[in-house]
Amino acid sequence: MMTGTIETTGNISAEKGGSIILQCHLSSTTAQVTQVNWEQQDQLLAICNADLGWHISPSFKDRVAPGPGLGLTLQSLTVNDTGEYFCIYHTYPDGTYTGRIFLEVLESSVAEHGARFQIP
């Protein structure tokens, strides 16, 4: 039975040209995290394998930095980066947990972080 929950940074906003940290945290399970995939719609941004470290998709390699931890730092933001991002936790023996973050990239300098929320 899958008992875990993923806590994410929720709905967040950031300035164009700036950077943002995408973070998820898996709790309430003793399952072992084998890999975390970071995806945006149909695109793979990066993978963090617990043993083999990071794989960064070449289309993002100049704008993505691994970490902190299992998170991902997205740099040099453009308005085209607005959208849904998913952290997909591959765990053993539970299986897959998915968290969702919505990022809005703003033209203005008024960019406030949204509240954290949980996805069961």
Partner: antibody
Amino acid sequence: EVQLQQSGPELVKPGASVKISCKTSGYTFTEFTMHWVKQSHGKSLEWIGGLKPDNGGISYNQKFKGRATLAVDKSSNTAYMELRSLTSEDSAVYYCARGAYYRYDADYWGQGTTLTVSS
Amino acid sequence: DIVLTQSHKFMSTSVGDRVSITCKASQDVKTAVAWYQQKSGQSPKLLIYSASYRNTGVPDRFTGSGSGTDFTFTIDSVQAEDLAVYFCQQHYSTPFTFGTGTKLELK
């Protein structure tokens, strides 16, 4: 120039063990994952596992876990794969292959080591 | 484990032809697919990574495309030296797996 030089062919008896080496040069050994791949005669490729030399992280294909052991000697920039309890099914060519920088695909391959298991 | 199916074990072609080799994944692997060329008696050689990126030094007649579950490797104008076995590989999740291979041969 990046080079991966593997040890020579091996002829061993069923039930025995073998240790294949992969001596590297031309790059910073600890910065790149080393993968090991099996190719049975005339067949496809099978990923055995990968090892990240900087932190010792190892990922095994469950099919080989318990019989295969991956290791490195950072002082000599050499990767090793030991395979135990050998059977005729293990007769194959074994490759070491360097994982590309911040990627999981393999951009440089050793020349292969032919293992024959026969009594 | 993710299964990669290369439906054609053999493909016949002529020098100068355009040829496409397909690879189908048993589940969504986004763009985490590489293509390797293996000539007889040699080690595999990386041609394409992340579905569509050409490895350093690979001629531009080689291209890769696709995402999700369906991938294609194309040689625009086959040369005699392209006769080899071509394998796809997924690196979306461990264990990393390879396709069964497609052998390109002359008609």
